[in-house]
């Protein structure tokens, strides 16, 4: 049947409207014209659109549709963003708190062996930053370099307080002494792997929430080709040059055209809900070892225990070491006692238990929930679209893209645009270079968070010493335990808090004039309070 | 005396293979990051490339990258890079450097004598 | 990676100051890492004066000083003396943990 002739034979209406997308009106004819010249909007009739019109129209289109993709991805890109931002200074802060305890541990047990101390701690700190963001240290080579750094120092300050500063060069013999001789008997492979597990993990957590953002990123900028421009122009703008402003598309025919124009995006599907799937398992395995706050904050704890365990050896092992660095003394120094009671800090960090305080580890669950309700963000594009532009409810008298229908027959509105373009060969093209791009990195960090998600239900690793030493399980109630053996154990009740600033900060620059006292200790601390509340309206 | 020396600096074409050595003594060489800095004629200092005190961390300039491989062998206390692929702009006296450090770069507290490498057809 | 950039030369008569500039971007100096300086004589290899900002190891005589804010890092030689005629270097690195020096500046004691 012939479509109803334009309501306004002057194409008036036409006018007025498309003089809001383009300023000027040479381009609209005053009656309407044959439009032999048009390729998208193809006519039945007389038309109200000329050639260039045609083109400003699919210009338009294209727009649109950037922007409607970019505010449908607006809520989950906020979300991965902010939660990127608020674990890389959560974690940021965890360190800074480690260090702290580290100091405040030194300075409350060994005055003697500060400031170097703080100096080799506050550079193990560094790395541990370091190593979070992305660079590429080993994690051994670090805390090798620590415990290097402090032997010469514990040795030369505690053991053999007596040296005169002109035995200085046995400084070198002492570095290699450290390692031949196991004088920290396994507390460094102890804290090596208690260290890189929890870092790898960390480390990987906040690289895939940049990817994430990454991919967001990638969909949200994307540039429609131009047989999308096409299909969206004759679903958007054909029917007004039909002078039929008040039209809308139907919305069996906006979700044909919008999977045609979104199928390179689709793809992203399958690899996006793998990666939030993958993510969530990585998450769930974020505890002990594998939890670097539960990690790091009890790190000060084993390097005490291992101070401790070499002053237990130290009358054996300063006979060893005068043997051994006799060429690098002028001569041999007697070996100072300690009574081994003054090196145990008796002390135990205790956090008072809040209801509801939010924890790093809570957070992590919290922001896989809300990513959860993504998983079907790509598969559902088309849909959302369709949903947020102006379709007509129940598909009845609607525009399918030639004509003003009483209802939308997919089948038909196909075969009618099957002459204009093919809709199957817009899908077959393949998704465009940036999206293969992403698809890969997606593809990648889906790889790394696979292989490094643990087996439900794995506790610490075992078998970690040969001399003994179990890195332990701490039962099955809700307390994880910290740190090396004996004296030293933290317990902290339901997880470490995700932390806000401490009281004190104790920092390398202003510890060694700090007068006081900055071991964490009873009633020192009272409570670490709730970060996200500052950082992040998504609660 | 803590002490680097270098070997391996010669005539090469452009397009040929050099490998330069560090014996490195007084000082425990495992437990240092150590460094390759080149300085060409009459230029100034030039960072090539570092490796942990365990090798387990190489890194490299963007002009050596893909055609110079460091190494190191703690047993024997030398350092060595592999330098493939020479160019003329490669010509350089070649510094082993000492880092105060073993996890990564920081400052180089000992330097050897350099040994020159001339790449030239 | 860019290097850092120092003024190619500085001058003075002995017992004068000299400074030199050592400017960096937010990614090497600006950033986290520490800067060090180098004194090397023609034909000799470089020797460290400076580590950590300000630090200075053990021999160097304390004429030298070296200080850091913001992206920039100096170095200063108080009381100049013929032997500090030579040229010096500053160095950090970047968050790659690649090293970066800069170009130099040749210091003459007039």
């Known amino acids: 049947q012939p479509p109803p002739p334009p309501p306004d034979a002057t194409c008036h209406q036409v006018r007025s409207f498309f003089q809001r997308l383009q300023p000027g009106l040479k381009w609209v004819p005053e009656t309407p014209v044959p439009g032999s010249d048009l390729q998208v909007c193809l006519p039945k009739g007389p038309t109200c659109c000329s050639r260039k019109m045609e083109e400003k129209y699919q210009l338009t289109a294209r727009l649109n549709m950037e922007q409607l993709l970019q505010s449908a991805s607006m809520e989950l890109k906020f979300l991965i963003i902010q939660n990127a931002a608020v674990f890389q200074e959560a974690f940021e802060i965890v360190v800074r708190h480690a260090k702290n305890y580290t100091n405040a541990m030194f300075k409350n047990n060994y005055p003697s062996l500060t400031p170097q101390a703080f100096e080799f701690v506050g550079e193990f700190f560094t790395d541990v930053s370091l190593y979070i963001l992305g660079s590429d240290i080993n994690v051994d080579d670090m805390v090798n370099e620590l415990f290097d750094s402090l032997f010469p120092v514990i040795y030369t300050q505690l053991m053999n307080p007596g040296l005169p500063d002109s035995a200085l060069d046995i400084n070198e013999c002492l570095r290699g002494a450290r390692r031949d001789l196991k004088v920290f008997g396994n507390f460094p492979k102890l804290i090596m792997t208690q260290v890189s597990k929890s870092l790898q993990v960390t480390r990987i957590f906040l690289q895939a929430l940049n990817l994430g953002i990454e991919v967001i990123n990638t969909t949200d900028h994307l540039k429609f080709s131009k047989d999308c421009g096409r299909m969206l122009t004759r679903m958007w703008y054909c029917s007004y040059c039909q002078g039929l402003m008040m039209v809308k598309p139907c919305g069996g025919y906006c979700n044909v055209v919008m999977q045609g124009c979104m199928a390179g995006v689709v793809e992203i599907d399958k690899y996006w809900r793998e990666y939030i799937l993958s993510l969530e398992e990585l998450v769930n395995g974020m505890y002990r070892i594998y939890d670097m706050e539960n990690v790091l904050l009890g790190l000060f704890s084993t390097i005490h225990d291992s101070i401790q365990y070499v002053q237990k050896n130290a009358g054996k092992l300063t006979t060893t070491i005068g043997k051994l660095c006799a060429h690098s003394q002028q001569r041999q120094y007697r070996s100072a006692y300690y009574p081994e009671d003054l090196f145990i800090d008796k002390k135990v960090l205790k956090v008072a238990h809040v209801e509801h305080e939010e924890t790093l580890s809570s957070r992590r669950r919290e922001l896989i929930q809300k990513l959860k309700s993504f998983i079907s963000f790509y598969s559902a594009l088309p849909g959302y679209i369709c949903s947020h532009s102006p379709v007509a409810e129940n598909d009845t008298l609607c525009w399918n893209g030639q004509e003003l229908v009483e209802r939308y027959s997919q089948k038909a509105a196909r075969n009618g645009m099957k002459n204009q373009f093919n809709l199957h060969e817009l899908k077959m093209k393949g998704p465009e270079p940036v999206v293969s791009q992403i698809i890969d990195k997606l593809k990648h960090i889906n790889q790394l968070l696979r292989t490094m998600s643990m087996p439900k239900g794995r506790v610490l690793d075992k078998n970690l010493d040969e001399e003994g030493f179990e890195s332990g399980d701490c039962g099955d109630d809700e307390d994880e335990c910290i740190g090396g053996s004996g004296d030293g154990m933290i317990k902290v009740k339901n997880q470490l808090r995700f932390l806000a600033e401490l009281a004190y900060d104790l920092d390398v620059d202003d510890a060694p004039g700090n007068s006081q006292q900055a071991t964490p200790k009873d009633n020192e601390i009272s409570t670490f309070h709730n970060l996200g509340n500052v950082h992040s309206p998504l609660k | 005396q803590v002490q680097l020396q270098e070997s391996g600096g010669g005539l090469v074409q452009p397009g040929r293979s050099l490998r330069l050595s560090c014996a490195a003594s007084g000082f425990t060489f495992s437990s240092y990051a150590m460094h390759w800095v080149r300085q060409a004629p009459g230029k100034g200092l030039e960072w090539v490339s570092a490796i942990s005190s365990s090798g387990g961390s190489t890194y490299y300039a963007d002009s050596v990258k893909g055609r110079f491989t460091i190494s190191r062998d703690n047993s024997k206390n030398t350092l060595y890079l592999q330098m493939n692929s020479l160019r003329a702009e490669d010509t350089a006296v070649y510094y082993c450097a000492k880092d105060r450090r073993g996890s990564h770069a920081d400052a180089f507290d000992v330097w050897g004598q350099g040994t020159l490498v001339t790449v030239s057809s | 990676q860019s290097a850092l950039t120092q003024p190619p030369s500085a001058s003075g008569s002995p017992g004068q100051s000299v400074t030199i500039s050592c400017t960096g971007t937010?990614?090497?100096?600006?950033?986290?890492?520490?800067v060090s300086w180098y004194q090397q004589y023609p034909g000799k290899a470089p020797k460290l004066l400076i580590y950590k900002n300000l630090l200075r190891p053990s021999g160097v005589p304390d004429r030298f000083s070296g200080s850091k804010s913001g992206t920039s890092a100096s170095l200063a030689i108080t009381g100049l003396q013929a032997e500090d005629g030579a040229d010096y270097y500053c160095?950090?690195?970047?968050?790659?943990?690649?090293?970066?020096f800069g170009g130099g500046t040749k210091v003459t004691v007039l």
């Open positions: 160095q950090s690195y970047d968050s790659s943990l690649r090293v970066v």
């Open positions: 937010s990614s090497d100096v600006g950033h986290k890492f520490p």
